[in-house]
């Protein structure tokens, strides 16, 4: 029954995200005659593609059709067959890619010319297979989730759709973490934009937004991992790694070859004399703090103020949304509620990288082993780059709010790069009075 | 449009050094390595090393090691590349080019000519 | 390192006729898949430009009758038919692995 054809009149449109840990598939639906109205545009399903981002097929790209195959006959159910020639497939790839190209554009394009055979198999209409670029990245992410959350709709409304959500026209800043970048994007106070690289200029809706946008590649949190690993071991004695950011007791080997197959780690790259050394958890999470800090340069500047690494940060104003792994690694550890204090998110992390791995294993039993091992790393980074490198303070980490999803779809790039590529935001208002939220919430 | 646009000229004294630049535009300058390529007497081209504008780690060519020095100023999107220790040899057209293993955009060249 | 050997050192064509170009590695290029052999033409007092990537992949803007082809260790570049432009210096390159390579060159001239 699910491919006969709907009484009502919709459309569909599918985005697959190709990240560098994983990809993962999202369709999109919204009604055929209000395409150009705010916030009608949902997300009906999301599939996780099993395995790892696409990047990591070089040496086997023979094998990227079978990969792509369970999330795209997903795809074939939850869209009625009817639909399905006219349903734009969009596949946009980010920084795992990127760091690929950067390596060689060759191997970047054979991936992406075997990812664009394998979905022009489909009975969709295909649209190609691209790498997105940063500042795509992080436009479309703030596109999404002020799409979601109302804020281009003329109307002010009554009622609130999230708990968070305060009742003005003020946009949100987006905050995203994926596994090889991170992006901040905000709407700046009267501030001039120094950096023209960072700066956005946007009609929405009949309104100017003048926004802000860096991506840092590198700074997702599998990479910086990478980054931290490869400036310690620079100054360790012997094959042993003694590490703050795992817990005590874990132990894992780790190949000299793997630390320095990413670009992310060529600043910190010299010969060792061994070939393999051992991480030894020690849990400390200060320490950690401390080893995470010396990855972001603070020492040099040429704008009135810098993020890090000499990249210019305008003063943070509003509120943000931080979502993709921020959101999954906080709600992991618990931390994603707005009451909670920066001070009480600290205390909290303290005590979670300081249990030892035998009971950390234990608590979670389900997780598993090489997830479960990196929440201690990774909660601590997030807390280092928003505190130190994006400088929110404890009174303005009250502004961050960690979301998963809004209104049932979820906070990301995808939703704005396909509002984008099927012309639904128009750059003025449309005429017709577009529905309030309440009519089909 | 990607464009490379190098710096003019030198005329420099054996045993100085030189110090060349590369101001790119048109994409996004992290995203790219920036290589450096030797040209000498019009035919030999000989590749000096790259650098990962991202966070500035360099690979060379062992010939050039100890003597070539790589270097990026990422506000200004620029790549640099110091020579040092010029002899006559040196004399040669520089190169800067864009690309992982694909040198798809080229500067035009520096020349450099070692006379006392 | 990869030695690229480039033959002929010069080459007279007349317009309209093929001109081929070979390039021989000291070992395989190849690696994933993918042939690291890239075909440059430089004409005096200009840079290189990239006219095959990839081994047989056409650059950005670079017309038809210039044809890459090979693998492994043994590649070639054919221009047909020759026309006047096509007077410069040609260049193969590795970038298989580190130190990167060039050939030696060939001098492409009418005849």
């Known amino acids: 029954t699910q491919n006969k054809a709907l009484p009502e009149n919709v459309k569909y449109g599918i985005v697959l995200d190709a990240g560098s840990s994983h990809t993962s598939l999202y369709i999109y639906k919204w009604p055929a005659e209000k395409e150009n109205d705010t916030g009608v545009v949902h997300q009906v399903e999301e599939c996780r593609v099993k395995g790892p981002g696409i990047s990591k097929f070089v040496q086997k790209v023979n094998e990227i059709g079978i990969y792509l195959t369970d999330c795209m006959e997903r795809a074939r159910e939850v869209i009625p067959r009817s639909q399905h020639q006219e349903t734009p497939v969009y596949l946009g790839a980010t920084a795992g890619m990127r760091l690929l190209r950067m390596e060689s554009e060759e191997l970047a394009d054979r991936v992406l010319d075997v990812v664009e055979r394998s979905l022009s198999n489909y009975p969709f209409d295909f649209q190609g297979a691209r790498i997105i670029t940063g500042q795509e990245e992080g436009a479309y992410g703030w596109i999404t989730i002020n799409y979601l959350l109302g804020k281009f709709s003329q109307k002010t409304r009554w009622f609130s759709i999230v708990p968070y959500e305060t009742n003005n026209q003020e946009t949100f800043g987006a905050l995203d973490l994926g596994g090889a970048s991170t992006q901040v994007t905000f709407v700046p106070q009267n501030q001039t934009i120094e950096s023209p690289d960072n700066a956005l200029q946007f009609r929405l809706y009949g309104k100017d937004y003048n926004v802000y946008t860096h991506s840092f590649l590198c700074y997702g949190k599998d990479q910086a991992l990478w980054q931290k690993l490869a400036k310690d071991i620079q100054v360790a004695s012997n094959e042993i790694l003694r590490d703050p950011c795992f817990h005590p007791g874990y132990k894992k080997v780790v190949n000299v070859s793997d630390l320095y197959k990413t670009p992310c780690t060529k600043r910190f790259e010299m010969t060792l004399p061994f070939q393999q050394f051992e991480i030894q958890g020690i849990g400390n999470y200060q320490q950690c703090h401390q080893s995470i800090l010396e990855l972001f340069n603070t020492s040099y500047c040429p704008y009135s103020q810098c993020a890090f690494n000499g990249i210019f940060l305008p003063p943070l104003q509003g509120d943000f949304g931080a979502f993709s792994a921020f959101y999954f690694v906080m709600k992991f550890l618990n931390l994603t509620s707005e009451k909670v204090s920066q001070e009480k998110v600290t205390e909290m992390m303290k005590n979670f990288c300081a249990k030892s791995w035998e009971a950390i294993k234990t608590s979670y039993a389900g997780v598993k082993e090489k997830y479960l091992s990196e929440y201690c790393f990774s909660g601590t980074y997030i807390l280092s780059l928003l505190l130190q490198g994006y400088h929110f303070t404890a009174d303005s980490w009250e502004h961050i709010h960690f979301i998963g999803k809004i209104q049932g779809s979820d906070a990301g790039w995808t939703l704005g790069y396909m509002l984008n590529l099927t012309n639904m935001i128009p750059a003025e208002q449309p005429l017709s009075t577009p529905l309030s939220h309440s009519t089909y919430v | 449009e990607v464009q490379l646009q190098q710096s003019g000229p030198e005329l420099v004294k054996p045993g100085a050094s030189v110090k060349m630049s590369c101001k790119a535009s048109?994409?996004?300058?992290?995203?790219?390595?920036m290589h450096w390529v030797k040209q000498s007497h019009g035919r030999t081209l000989e590749w000096i090393g790259y650098?990962?504008?991202?966070?500035?780690?360099?690979t060379f060519n062992q010939k050039f090691k100890g003597r070539a020095t790589l270097t990026v100023n990422t506000s200004s999107r620029t790549a640099y590349m110091e020579l040092r220790s010029l002899t006559s040899e040196d004399s040669a057209a520089y190169y800067c080019?864009?690309?992982?293993?694909?040198?798809?955009?080229w500067g035009q060249g520096t020349l450099v000519t070692v006379s006392a | 390192d990869i030695v690229l050997t480039q033959s002929p050192a010069s080459l007279a064509v007349s317009l309209g006729q093929r001109a081929t170009i070979s390039c021989r590695a000291s070992?395989?290029?190849?690696?994933?898949?993918?042939?690291?052999m890239y075909w440059f033409q430089q004409k005096p007092g200009q840079p290189p430009n990239l006219l095959i990537y990839?081994?047989?992949n056409q650059g950005s803007g670079v017309p038809a009758r210039f044809r890459g082809s090979g693998s492994g260790t043994d590649f070639s570049l054919n221009i047909h038919p020759m026309e006047a432009d096509d007077t410069a210096m040609y260049f193969c390159?590795?970038?298989?692995?580190?130190?990167?390579?060039f050939g030696g060159g060939t001098k492409l001239e009418i005849k």
């Open positions: 080019a864009r690309g992982g293993t694909r040198f798809a955009y």
């Open positions: 048109g994409y996004t300058f992290t995203d790219y390595n």
């Open positions: 650098i990962v504008p991202l966070n500035g780690g360099s």
């Open positions: 070992e395989s290029v190849d690696n994933f898949g993918v042939s690291f």
């Open positions: 990839g081994a047989s």
């Open positions: 390159q590795q970038t298989k692995e580190v130190p990167y390579t």
